[in-house]
Interface confidence: medium
Amino acid sequence: VEVQVSEDPVVALVDTDATLRCSFSPEPGFSLAQLNLIWQLTDTKQLVHSFTEGRDQGSAYSNRTALFPDLLVQGNASLRLQRVRVTDEGSYTCFVSIQDFDSAAVSLQVAAPYSKPSMTLEPNKDLRPGNMVTITCSSYQGYPEAEVFWKDGQGVPLTGNVTTSQMANERGLFDVHSVLRVVLGANGTYSCLVRNPVLQQDAHGSVTITGQPLTF
């Protein structure tokens, strides 16, 4: 028996359902009584879901997995993972045994988009050219960690005085806070781009300083 899975990682958004595709080619006369199907975590060998002895043995993994029982006889051994969490990320191996056996691994990549950045300025009044200001760009609840880029109004990258914090909450999602310290020109725009490297999603925030008032 030959097992086939997607070579590309499956990208799933947090809290959505994902399908890890796995298929085999049943011989003529194949019945489910002959099938032993096991899904497990590749690294730890932890059992995720199984079909043995002619029946679905159910989820061994937080009761969020399911097979496609009506499609098994056609050779579809795919696994449905519900309400995806950050901790589900990784490699899953599909083992199929009929008379002989084969296995293949599929990678699950978990992602969550970052919120539109909020921009804060310190100090935020009585600003003059030559003043040192701190601009903070904050974006929330993304995964994995973001790449953060700063640019001025002409699109020139600002890489100098930047510090970035990325902290995970109890669900494993990250909040990002990036701080740019800059000496003000006569007027200027400062833009922050928060990129999710898996989704290739860019979230933009900017602040324009033109004397008073400030524009966000």
């Epitope: 990682p9 901790t87 990784g90 490699s91 994995p144 510090t163 914090s165 902290m167 490297p197």
Partner: antibody, heavy 120, light 112 residues
């Protein structure tokens, strides 16, 4: 327990590019939640963070080295690599690869280190 | 960047006696999620650093319970209740709150 092993030349000439590879075993580089890192230690000195990469390609570099550093990943070989351009004697150090756990921001596994000397 | 200052830089200890290392941060390492992003590492002679304590006070897997981390905000302490010969090396604190991640300058523990 995941194992990390650094490899590459131990001697690099000034102005050239330092290239190192870290091979990960007993664990997949594609397992989520970990960030694959480079840290260096100048002779007899403390530790300096260089940068890290996520398996999907997102990179994060120390501002002081950002203009000279590239970190890349090859998930098919379970490896990640460091390139540092325009090296000088000040880049002579033991270079460590390490795994950073995203949830705690900690370097929980380290390679044995490789001494790279920059000299003509 | 965040600066971590360790003291003492050298610590001679008699086996069986306690030891204490201080790490002071230039800014608070407490984040709004309630976690404190301060780690401790030990680099034994000729070896790479090994992970001891994470998030301020949690022992890493396999670390003996004679090691404990404490502190909050900007002041942190690593305590060894009874020093053993195998504990010699350089101890580093590290902040994981903000890039660039930074380490203390190290405290060398040696046996008297």
């Amino acid at each position: 327990q995941v194992q990390l092993v650094e490899s590459g030349p131990g001697l690099v000439k000034p102005s050239q590019t330092l290239s190192l590879t870290c091979t990960v075993s007993d664990g997949s580089i594609s397992s989520g939640g970990y960030y694959w890192s480079w840290i260096r230690q100048h002779p007899g000195k403390g530790l300096e963070w260089i940068g890290y990469i996520y398996y999907s390609g997102g990179t994060y570099y120390s501002p002081s080295l950002k203009s000279r550093v590239t970190i890349s990943v090859d998930t098919s070989k379970n490896q990640f690599s460091l390139k540092l351009t325009s090296v000088t004697a000040a880049d002579t150090a033991v270079y460590y690869c390490a795994r950073r756990a995203g949830y705690s921001s900690s370097f929980d596994s380290w390679g044995q280190g490789i001494l790279v000397t920059v000299s003509s | 960047e965040i600066v971590l200052t360790q003291s003492p830089l050298s610590l001679p200890v008699t086996p069986g006696e306690p030891a204490s290392i201080s790490c002071r941060s230039s800014q608070s390492l407490l984040y709004s999620n309630g976690y404190t992003y301060l780690d401790w590492y030990l680099q034994k002679p000729g070896q790479s650093p090994q992970f001891l304590i994470y998030l301020g006070f949690n022992r890493a897997s396999g670390v003996p319970d004679r090691f404990s981390g404490s502190g909050s905000g900007t002041d942190f302490t690593l305590k060894i209740s009874r020093v053993e010969a195998e504990d010699v090396g350089v101890y580093y604190c590290m902040q994981g709150l903000q890039t660039p991640y930074t380490f203390g300058q190290g405290t060398k523990l040696e046996i008297k």
